[in-house]
């Protein structure tokens, strides 16, 4: 990075006083700085010298040195003040264009940095700036007026405060430009239309531009079509408005719709789809199978897609049992629309209970008629078990009760010692019982199945478990023989526990 | 008219970080820009280096290595930060506007 | 680094006097140049820069003098406030004082 002598980052001189600015680099220096009067340069090898003998207001200003042949592209500055009592400013342009929302530096620098507390900007003529002129100042800079509008291109003048009168500097231009973005800002409404033959029509295509130059048309699978075109201006906008009305519609104007807007810029195009129908319709579906399962305990949303013209006049969500007549909350029902011909209805079911398995059914209801859409919902258990000792045919045996859904599998395993639940240690036989007799098993409901174990002698010190389970969890049930030959005791002199 | 006031502790440790701060008041520091320099006692004055509101800087080569000087311009400061000091260190600092406004000086002793 | 050298150290005047103070530099430092006033246990005051300019607010039997490596500060007729320590100061590389002229009464 070039050194710059004298070692300041801004100086303070007189009008008149000899002004030496010295630029040390590695290789070759450049000075830049405002055009001024009075400078001379020259240059020393690998030092450049930018001298005055007589400066002046105009000398007022950032002087910038580079170094051309280093990659980083360093470099150093300072700013001189020539503090000239009759002129507080030097102004470095008498115009100032910018695009709209871009900053606009009015470039008065001031002489003497003494004046910065007491500088403001005005309009010519002393008036004040426009409402809402967001503006800041800098010494070394000038003015800046922030996001610059078109409305703020004016006269501007710069003032500063000089014992106790205000000074104002020469005049500058500020120019602020449109900005034309790109191509016209479209819409075209609706975004998609159904009517059935016979009906009235209307699709409106609208363009708006912050330049009055452009163009727009609306044009049915690629014919241009003669509409007459509003104008307008509003919100700092130019707006063209072409809006076809059809007062009986056939199947001939089906189709696609195109609106189309262009500039100096560009194009651009927007498109919508236009259905006509012979009747109305009104169709159901839904992204899910329509026969659910779900863990009882855990929540379940049923979700219909609706596909209807004319609108739904009516429509809820109904329980159609077996067990009981209680009907879904209206607040668990929610209804979203995906677009005007397009709704999807949600049933909130959360934790459900026993009692809320069954059919439920979406009806809805357009001038098309009726339709309904049904789902059913099965609740999976976990087995409970439960066993018994009885005699069947004169023979002593275990009979275990499993009842869930799915349906239960059954193992029965015979173990050493008196415990809640065999281990594997412990564990003395096993059988798998594939195939156990189903005792009920209705829709809606548990399956309960029942598996025998022939017992003829019931050890002691032992117990026989049943096992149930199936793919929501697992059941068991340990029964605990008290007494020895307890297989020529009834029952009820045996100790069972779950 | 402009005033600038040194604050900071006035002992600190062999090998610490001397830790000085610089308010300004009856202008803003966002203009100009601002300078450290120090005198031990009975000696001469000795440049520090300074900083612009743009955030440039310049130090004494001497010094360069061990010196920070920053602004903060919402709280209207600038600070000075003198890693690794010795007893060399002891002085009266003052900040200065530029070199034609000076705050009072506030004496550092660098001792265990 | 630039040097920069005052002499004379002290300087015994009387009220009234013309006196001079000389500050040399090591190597030419064109006119960027300034010098202070200092008294005991307050801030240098700043008097004139780039070698001749007064600092405003600043008495006007004050003048500074020079360019390239001789400078002069001269204070015309003495008065009893201006009995202080002087200091050059140099800013065309870097920043370096001279090592001070106290002005004492005779």
């Known amino acids: 990075i070039p050194v710059i002598e004298p070692s300041v980052p801004e100086l303070v001189v007189k009008p008149g006083a000899t002004v030496t600015l010295r630029c040390v680099g590695n290789g070759s220096v450049e000075w830049d700085g405002p055009p001024s009067p009075h400078w001379t340069l020259y240059s020393d090898g690998s030092s450049s010298i930018l001298s005055t003998n007589n400066a002046t207001f105009q000398n007022t200003g950032t002087y910038r040195c580079t170094e051309p042949g280093d990659p980083l592209g360093g470099s150093a500055a300072i700013h001189l003040y020539v503090k000239d009592p009759a002129r507080p400013w030097n102004v470095l342009a008498q115009e100032v264009v910018v695009f709209e929302d871009q900053d606009a530096l009015l470039p008065c620098l001031l002489t003497d940095p003494v004046l910065e507390a007491g500088v403001s900007l005005v309009r010519v003529r002393g008036r004040p700036l426009m409402r809402h002129t967001n503006y800041s100042f800098s010494p070394w800079h000038g003015f800046t007026i922030h996001r610059a509008k078109f409305i703020q291109s004016q006269d501007y003048q710069c003032s500063a405060l000089m014992g106790g009168r205000k000074v104002m500097s020469i005049s500058i231009r500020l120019k602020v430009q449109k900005v034309i973005p790109g191509p016209p800002a479209l819409t075209l409404v609706p975004a998609e239309l159904v009517r059935i033959r016979g009906e009235a029509a209307q699709i409106v295509c609208s363009a708006s531009s912050v330049d009055v130059n452009f163009d727009v048309f609306l044009q049915h699978n690629n014919t241009k079509l003669a509409i007459p075109q509003q104008s307008d201006f509003h919100n700092n906008r130019y707006q063209k408005v072409l809006t076809l009305n059809l007062d009986q519609v056939d199947f001939q104007h089906a189709g696609n719709y195109s609106c189309v807007a262009s500039n100096v810029q560009g194009k651009h195009s927007t498109s919508m789809f236009f259905r006509v129908v012979e009747s109305a319709y009104l169709n159901l579906s839904s992204e899910q199978n329509l026969i659910q399962e779900v863990t009882v305990g855990e929540g379940l949303n049923l979700k219909v897609m609706v596909e209807a013209y004319p609108g739904l006049q009516g429509f809820n969500w109904t329980y159609l049992g077996p067990f009981s007549d209680h009907q879904p909350e209206p607040k668990l029902a929610n209804a979203t629309t995906k677009d005007t011909y397009r709704h999807t209805f949600t049933l909130s079911l959360p934790r459900l209970k026993p009692s809320e398995a069954g059919r439920y059914s979406f009806l809805a209801r357009n001038p098309g008629g009726w339709r309904a859409l049904t789902f059913e919902l099965t609740l999976r258990y976990p087995p409970e078990v439960s066993v018994i000792w009885t005699f069947i045919n004169g023979s002593g045996t275990l009979l275990c009760a499993a009842s869930g859904y799915p349906q239960p599998n059954v193992t029965w395993l015979q173990c050493s010692g008196h415990t809640d639940r065999c281990d594997e240690a412990q564990v003395l036989q096993v059988w798998d019982d594939p195939y156990p007799e189903v005792l009920s098993q209705e829709p809606f409901h548990k399956v309960t199945v029942q598996s025998l174990l022939t017992v003829e002698t019931l050890e002691h010190n032992q117990t026989y478990e049943c096992r149930a389970h199936n793919s929501v969890g697992s059941g068991s049930w340990a029964f605990i023989p008290i007494s020895a030959g307890a297989h020529t005791h009834p029952p009820d002199e045996f100790l069972f526990t779950p | 008219q402009v005033q600038l006031q040194e604050s900071g502790p006035g002992l600190v440790k062999p090998s610490e970080t001397l830790s000085l701060t610089c308010t300004v008041s009856?202008?803003?520091?966002?203009?100009?820009?601002w300078t450290w320099i120090r005198q031990p006692p009975g000696k001469g004055l000795e440049w520090i280096g300074y900083?612009?509101?743009?955030?440039?800087?310049n130090y004494n080569p001497s010094l360069k290595s061990r010196v920070t000087i920053s602004v903060d311009t919402s709280k209207n400061q600038f600070s000075l930060k003198l890693s690794s000091v010795t007893a060399a260190d002891t002085a009266v600092y003052y900040c200065?506007?530029?070199?034609?406004?000076w705050g009072q000086g506030t004496l550092v002793t660098v001792s265990s | 680094d630039i040097q920069m050298t005052q002499s004379p150290s002290t300087l015994s005047a009387s009220v009234g006097d013309r006196v001079t103070i000389t500050c040399r530099a090591s190597?030419?430092?064109?006119?960027?140049l300034a010098w202070y006033q200092q008294k005991p246990g307050k801030a240098p005051k700043l008097l004139i820069y780039?070698?001749?300019s007064l600092e405003s607010g600043v008495p006007s039997r004050f003048s500074g003098s020079g360019s390239g490596t001789e400078f002069t500060l001269t204070i015309s007729s003495l008065q009893p406030d201006d009995f202080a320590t002087y200091y050059c100061?140099?800013?065309?590389?870097?920043?370096?004082f001279g090592q001070g002229t106290k002005v004492e009464i005779k």
């Open positions: 200065a506007r530029g070199f034609d406004y």
């Open positions: 009856g202008g803003s520091i966002s203009s100009s820009y």
């Open positions: 900083i612009h509101y743009s955030g440039s800087t």
């Open positions: 190597q030419s430092i064109s006119s960027w």
């Open positions: 780039m070698a001749s």
């Open positions: 100061q140099q800013y065309n590389s870097y920043w370096t």
